[in-house]
Each structure stands twice: as structure tokens, then as C-alpha cells.
């Protein structure tokens, strides 16, 4: 009764198509699969960035897989062939592992790469990234930003740089069609007559770095003798009302400060007859239903009401 064996996949490699971190893992079927013609062979693929604690594991019948990686670090992957139990009249048979690695050979000392990279997707409309030059680099150093997301044919270079002292220190992006809810890859590299510059790679999703405009049209309405309803409107732009969380700061008579977080565009405040003045500001942020993270907007303009004038509906800016 001979033991059933299967070879690992052939020609296992990680291919970099130039998408700044989105890589192809590909392989060929193992040798000597003739005995298993009636069988659907599967492959178990494990991969990770070097230094990561955990492997991502995929089982597939395909000869390729694609995923995003952090190109600041190396990548390691391994794959083996799986013969399901139906093919072997018994238990599943696994080949030995085929292994491969990939990394971009660095150049430049780490200090030369850009510092404090910061990207904000303003009002879910305009992406702006800014950075500081690397430590110890001369003014002849220039940084260039490239970006890619699924839907673009190839990585694009920034065409509208923000400059300081002749150096690129940021990028204003053009309109980015169908670019949210997918990984957005950036590489900032550089050149200098003086010394080589280390490249930096960044990956994020645009909906997670949105900074909305502040809410507008703040108003007061007396609900009852001891309740005032605060209302505001969502700012102009593409973000739907269901995507907002709000933070309100209310000041009564220059003393009491109330802070509250709410999910819609109203807040009811209990007041006393003694309240002489009420002021509030609101800011907004994209909520957990629309993103995993976000940036608070600036505070709105302050809206104030002085008690005795409430019946006349006088609202003071």
C-alpha cells in the first residue's frame, strides 16, 4: 500500500507590478499531477510582511493571488499543494512548502525619508498630503509622490505639489474617481545631488481620513419652559447625513460647559429660568457606519442666545 505524495507548486514567486504595494503572488501546478487528473487540486498560501506576528492564510484553486503589502518591509510567503481526501481515499495529503521572499532593495539612510507624512481627505472630496523633509537633507533634495489604487492603469505622479523653499512638501490630488473603500497606495521617493534618499510607502483607505466641513445654520427652538432644542445642518458636500457623528459644546452663562456626542442634527437641552445666555458650537466626524476612523471637523461658528430675547426668536451670532 504505497503512500500518496504530491509535489509543491512550481515557480512560486512574488511579482511587483509597480502598484506601490499591491503585489501578485503566482505559481504553477506541481509536477506529476497525472495521477490525480480527476482531482481538483487546491493550494494553501500563507504570506505576511516580515516582522508581522501572524500569517494570512488563503486556500484557493487558482494559480495566483493578489494583496497589498507594506513595501517599507520585506514580504515572505509559502505555499503547498493540498489533495482533498476525496482524491486519496482517506485523509488530505499536503506537499512540502515552497517559499519565496520579496523586498525592495533600499537606498539611503532611514533619516533621509520623509517625516510626519499626513494625509487628509477634506470633506470626502479633496485629498491633500503633506510631509516634512528628512533629517539632515539639503535644500537640493526633492521629494516626489506617486499613488495608485485599483482602477488606475498605473501609478501616477502628483501634478500639483505644495512647495516650501523650493522643496516639495505636499501634494494636492486631482479628483479621485471611485477611490474610497479600497486601499490607496502612496510612495514618496526623493533625489539629491548630495546623498541617496530613502523611499517611504504608505497605505490607507480614503474614507478613514475624511475631515468634514463644520456644520452650518445653528439655531435654537424653545420646546418647553425648561427645554431648548439646538439644531444645525450638515455642510454642503457629498457626505450623507447618515454618515455623521457630532460633538456639541454648550456654555451657559459663561460658566457651565456641557459636551455631548450625538448621531443626528438636534440636541435637546434642559435649562433653568435663570439661564441668561446660551452659546454652542458643533463639529462633525464621519461615523462608524461609513468608515473605520475619521478626523473631527473644525468647530462651527458660535451661535448664542440671550434668555429674555428667546420669545422674539432673536438669534445672536
Amino acid at each position: 500500500d504505497t503512500e500518496i505524495k504530491v509535489n509543491p507548486p512550481q515557480d512560486f514567486e512574488i511579482v511587483d507590478p509597480g502598484y506601490l504595494g499591491y503585489l501578485y503572488l503566482q505559481w504553477q501546478p506541481p509536477l506529476s499531477l497525472d495521477h490525480f487528473k480527476e482531482c481538483t487540486v487546491e493550494y494553501e498560501l500563507k504570506y505576511r510582511n516580515i516582522g508581522s506576528e501572524t500569517w494570512k492564510t488563503i486556500i484557493t484553486k487558482n494559480l495566483h493571488y493578489k494583496d497589498g503589502f507594506d513595501l517599507n518591509k520585506g514580504i515572505e510567503a509559502k505555499i503547498h499543494t493540498l489533495l482533498p481526501w476525496q482524491c486519496t481515499n482517506g485523509s488530505e495529503v499536503q506537499s512540502s512548502w515552497a517559499e519565496t521572499t520579496y523586498w525592495i532593495s533600499p537606498q539611503g539612510i532611514p533619516e533621509t525619508k520623509v517625516q510626519d507624512m499626513d494625509c487628509v481627505y477634506y470633506n470626502w472630496q479633496y485629498l491633500l498630503c503633506s510631509w516634512k523633509p528628512g533629517i539632515g537633507v539639503l535644500l537640493d533634495t526633492n521629494y516626489n509622490l506617486f499613488y495608485w489604487y485599483e482602477g488606475l492603469d498605473h501609478a501616477l505622479q502628483c501634478v500639483d505639489y505644495i512647495k516650501a523653499d523650493g522643496q516639495n512638501i505636499g501634494c494636492r490630488f486631482p479628483y479621485l474617481e471611485a477611490s474610497d473603500y479600497k486601499d490607496f497606495y502612496i510612495c514618496v521617493n526623493g533625489s539629491s545631488e548630495n546623498k541617496p534618499i530613502r523611499s517611504s510607502y504608505f497605505t490607507f483607505q480614503l474614507q478613514n481620513i475624511v475631515k468634514p466641513l463644520p456644520p452650518v445654520y445653528l439655531t435654537f427652538t424653545r420646546e418647553s419652559s425648561c427645554e431648548i432644542k439646538l439644531k444645525w445642518s450638515i455642510p454642503l458636500g457629498p457626505i450623507p447625513a447618515r454618515c455623521f457623528d457630532y460633538e456639541i459644546e454648550i456654555r451657559e452663562d459663561d460658566t457651565t460647559l456641557v459636551t455631548a456626542t450625538v448621531e443626528n442634527e438636534t440636541y435637546t437641552l434642559k435649562t433653568t429660568n435663570e439661564t441668561r445666555q446660551l452659546c454652542f458650537v458643533v463639529r462633525s466626524k464621519v461615523n462608524i457606519y461609513c468608515s473605520d476612523d475619521g478626523i473631527w471637523s473644525e468647530w462651527s461658528d458660535k451661535q448664542c442666545w440671550e434668555g429674555e430675547d428667546l420669545s422674539k426668536k432673536t438669534l445672536l451670532r
Epitope: 532593495s105 537606498q107 541617496p196
Partner: antibody, heavy 116, light 108 residues
Framework: EVQLVESGGGLVQPGGSLRLSCAAS????????VHWVRQAPGKGLEWVGV???????DYNSALMSRFTISKDNAKNSLYLQMNSLRAEDTAVYYC??????????WGQGTLVTVSS | DIQMTQSPSSLSASVGDRVTITCTAS???????LHWYQQKPGKAPKLLIY???NLASGVPSRFSGSGSGTDFTLTISSLQPEDFATYYC?????????FGGGTKVEIK
């Protein structure tokens, strides 16, 4: 197996020149950077410079004007050209492979003695 | 330049002792770029610990590293005869790359 072998050291007079070689095997200089590091007798380690896989170079600025690092990818070899040598350049010179921003393999070193 | 100051510069210890070597950087160094090397007389340095706390291939688990910012530590939990050597910390963060002055671990 990764190996680095330095050669070219010896006795040289002050003001003279010397060219050290580092023959690499088990990896390609087109994929890995290689550093030169020196150690004066009884002293600590001093970084001289690095030739990156892509061909660019970083130097210790204190030595930059007199020392030049080059490589020959076809021969998988790295070189350190040292000019205007001084007594204080007397040291064992090591080449070391760069891997993930550390020096993971070192050669056995070659001794350079600058003396009249 | 970032100065790397090791202490002590030498120490005498017995087999089985716990040994701690400290390395202080004159400027903050990312933990990713702080490494430790071991050098025995007449031999080349050997990478011992990379990125502050990761053991290089083949290094026994009695070696460990820790720290952040400007203060880093190498610890040998139970000194073995083959551990008598000189140890160097190294910063790979800023140019020029620099090493500590070394700590020589001798047999008591």
C-alpha cells in the same frame, strides 16, 4: 552560503593609497547593499560607508573626501579606494552585508597599516 | 552625529550570572534601527539582536534586548562560557551610522 572575503590590506606609507576588495558570494550585490566598517587596533567600530544595491553611496562625511566606494556587479565585488592615508587610518577593514537596515553578515577583515 | 555611550565599558562575571549592558544615545533612535553585535577576539562582529529586541538567526534565547528613545539594554540571563566577548550597540537611524564604544565581558 553567504560569504564576504576582504583583500588588499597591507603596509602603506602616510600619504599613500590602497584599494581594498570585498568578494561577495551567496547573494547578489544588485539585491543587497554592502557596508565598509573599520576597527582601529584595540578600539571600537567605525562606519566608513555603504554602497546600495541600486548603485548609490552613503559615506561617513568625516572620511568622504579621501575614501571612495565602488562595486562591480558582474564580479559581485565591492571596493574601497583609500587616498591620502594617515596613521589614524590604521585598522582592520570589514565589509558587511546590509539586510533590513542591519549588518547581518561580515567578512573576516583585512588589516591596513599606515606607517613610515 | 549620534553618540552611543555604553556602560559599563568592561565587566567581570561568572558563568550563570545575569549580565546587563546599557546603551544611551545622544539623540532619540527609532527602536527599529537599534542593533547589538557580539565580537570575539580576532574575529569579525556578529549580529546578535536587531531592532532592539529581535534575536538574529541562531542566537540563543538567553540573550534579550529592550528599550526605546535614547535608552537601550542588552541582557544575558545566564552567562555561558561562549558569551565572553565584546558587545557593541549600533544605531542605523542617522548618518553617520555609529556604534557604542563596546562592553567587554570577561571571566571573573
Amino acid at each position: 552560503e553567504v560569504q564576504l572575503v576582504e583583500s588588499g590590506g597591507g603596509l602603506v606609507q602616510p600619504g599613500g593609497s590602497l584599494r581594498l576588495s570585498c568578494a561577495a558570494s551567496g547573494f547578489s550585490l544588485t539585491k543587497y547593499g554592502v557596508h565598509w566598517v573599520r576597527q582601529a587596533p584595540g578600539k571600537g567600530l567605525e562606519w566608513v560607508g555603504v554602497k546600495w544595491a541600486g548603485g548609490s553611496t552613503d559615506y561617513n562625511s568625516a572620511l568622504m573626501s579621501r575614501f571612495t566606494i565602488s562595486k562591480d556587479n558582474a564580479k559581485n565585488s565591492l571596493y574601497l579606494q583609500m587616498n591620502s592615508l594617515r596613521a589614524e587610518d590604521t585598522a582592520v577593514y570589514y565589509c558587511a552585508r546590509d539586510h533590513r537596515d542591519a549588518m547581518d553578515y561580515w567578512g573576516q577583515g583585512t588589516l591596513v597599516t599606515v606607517s613610515s | 552625529d549620534i553618540q552611543m555611550t555604553q556602560s559599563p565599558s568592561s565587566l567581570s562575571a561568572s558563568v550563570g550570572d545575569r549580565v546587563t549592558i546599557t546603551c544611551t544615545a545622544s539623540l532619540s533612535v527609532s527602536s527599529t534601527y537599534l542593533h547589538w553585535y557580539q565580537q570575539k577576539p580576532g574575529k569579525a562582529p556578529k549580529l546578535l539582536i536587531y531592532s532592539t529586541s529581535n534575536l538574529a538567526s541562531g542566537v540563543p534565547s538567553r540573550f534579550s534586548g529592550s528599550g526605546s528613545g535614547t535608552d537601550f539594554t542588552l541582557t544575558i540571563s545566564s552567562l555561558q562560557p561562549e558569551d565572553f566577548a565584546t558587545y557593541y550597540c549600533h544605531q542605523y537611524h542617522r548618518s553617520p551610522l555609529t556604534f557604542g564604544g563596546g562592553t567587554k565581558v570577561e571571566i571573573k
